[in-house]
Interface confidence: low
């Protein structure tokens, strides 16, 4: 028969012959022949290959460098690379998460609109009228001003975006 010019999925062409690729987690040791199957070997410790392949060397797992604020989020297997993320309070500087920076805090007068994650920074928003934040925080939202009326009190000092209202007792008319 005519030698093949293309091979099926999970095969590759070598010496006019279709050989099976090695499955994920394994590397190629020797190509198939007319009489023998492709020979594959599992990747070693701290190595991986994530596709059907004919690689003769496995890839090294990514190193999550603690000096860059990185830690292992998901340990690599023979078929997957290690996934790094940032230590608590830090987030990745890029999608590849090769280094980390500290989450920013929202200043007084600003509240957290979206808490930072391992991959995105804190998003702050100005406290609108009726709300305040008196702390610098990476977690606190703007708090609503206290409602003096519900406590049967009156406003003695107006609130700002940084301070709560101050409530006091109702003025009593002397008899």
């Amino acid at each position: 028969p005519e030698p093949p010019t293309a091979c099926r999925e999970k095969q590759y062409l070598i010496n006019s012959q279709c050989c099976s690729l090695c499955q994920p987690g394994q590397k190629l040791v020797s190509d198939c022949t007319e009489f023998t199957e492709t020979e594959c070997l599992p990747c070693g410790e701290s190595e991986f290959l994530d596709t059907w392949n004919r690689e003769t060397h496995c890839h090294q797992h990514k190193y999550c460098d603690p000096n860059l604020g990185l830690r292992v989020q998901q340990k690599g297997t023979s078929e997957t690379d290690t996934i790094c993320t940032c230590e608590e309070g830090w987030h990745c500087t890029s999608e590849a998460c090769e280094s980390c920076v500290l989450h920013r805090s929202c200043s007084p007068g600003f509240g957290v609109k979206q808490i930072a994650t391992g991959v995105s920074d804190t998003i702050c928003e100005p406290c609108p009228v009726g709300f305040f934040s008196n702390v610098s925080s990476a977690f606190e939202k703007c708090h609503p001003w206290t409602s003096c009326e519900t406590k049967d009190l009156v406003v003695q000092q107006a609130g700002t975006n940084k301070t709560d209202v101050v409530c006091g007792p109702q003025d009593r008319l002397r008899a």
Epitope: P24, V72, Q73, Q74, K75, T85, T117, G118, S120
Partner: antibody, heavy 126, light 112 residues
Framework: QVQLVESGGGVVQPGRSLRLSCAAS????????MHWVRQAPGKGLEWVAV????????YHADSVKGRFTISRDNSKNTLYLQMNSLRAEDTAVYYC???????????????????WGQGTTVTVSS | DIVMTQSPLSLPVTPGEPASISCRSS???????????LDWYLQKPGQSPQLLIY???NRASGVPDRFSGSGSGTDFTLKISRVEAEDVGVYYC?????????FGQGTKVEIK
């Protein structure tokens, strides 16, 4: 709503073949890994096979390896289990199940087999 | 393969009383990301299995808070704080750390 519906079960003689289907609806089928799990009459649950969301990775239990093949057609939102050389011990209710996940810190985390079909019965008997 | 062992295999319960099921794995299910890859499923009579708990202690959507999962490594427990009549069925633990997935033998919970 999110739903999985199996079909294709029936009575078949030993050595014959059968193809089970699992039709998915109510979610993005191509985003989820899928499993087949079976339950022999009066017995517990036995895992059969899993396939990755793109169909590139497949694993089968040793008890069915070389006889059963899991596959999927994302354009049809359907999961399949091709069962060849059937044996009496393959008699069971076959369930398909979705491998749930949730997005946390930009990564997908395992969330259990969160959706199951109603099951389809396969009886292998002469 | 990881072997999952449940106890007891049968559990008669009184409605309103607590119940507890144990599941032990032949190797640790604690992964390097800090999660225990263990699920609990309930199969009510004549129904498909349904997910109760994933990753050891996380309640699935819609599962009542009387169900809780605990444990780490190789020893896990499913607790029902106050059993209700609708909780009868067979409870299975399943390890999700490795392929092949493996289930416990099941614990049949029935009303006394």
């Amino acid at each position: 709503q999110v739903q999985l519906v199996e079909s294709g079960g029936g009575v078949v003689q030993p050595g014959r073949s059968l193809r089970l289907s699992c039709a998915a609806s109510g979610f993005t089928f191509s985003s989820y890994g899928m499993h087949w799990v079976r339950q022999a009459p009066g017995k517990g649950l036995e895992w059969v096979a899993v396939i990755s969301k793109d169909g590139g990775n497949k694993y089968h239990a040793d008890s069915v390896k070389g006889r059963f093949t899991i596959s999927r057609d994302n354009s049809k939102n359907t999961l399949y289990l091709q069962m060849n050389s059937l044996r009496a011990e393959d008699t069971a209710v076959y369930y398909c199940a979705r491998r749930g996940h949730q997005l946390v810190l930009g990564y997908y985390y395992y969330n259990g087999l969160d959706v199951w079909g109603q099951g389809t019965t396969v009886t292998v008997s002469s | 393969d990881i072997v999952m062992t449940q106890s007891p295999l049968s559990l008669p319960v009184t409605p309103g009383e607590p119940a507890s099921i144990s599941c032990r794995s032949s190797q640790s299910l604690l992964y390097s990301n800090g999660y225990n890859f263990l699920d609990w499923y309930l199969q009510k009579p004549g129904q498909s299995p349904q997910l109760l708990i994933y990753l050891g202690s996380n309640r699935a959507s819609g599962v009542p808070d009387r169900f809780s999962g605990s444990g780490s490594g190789t020893d896990f427990t499913l607790k029902i704080s106050r059993v209700e009549a609708e909780d009868v069925g067979v409870y299975y633990c399943m390890q999700a750390l490795q392929t092949p997935r493996t289930f416990g033998q099941g614990t049949k919970v029935e009303i006394k």
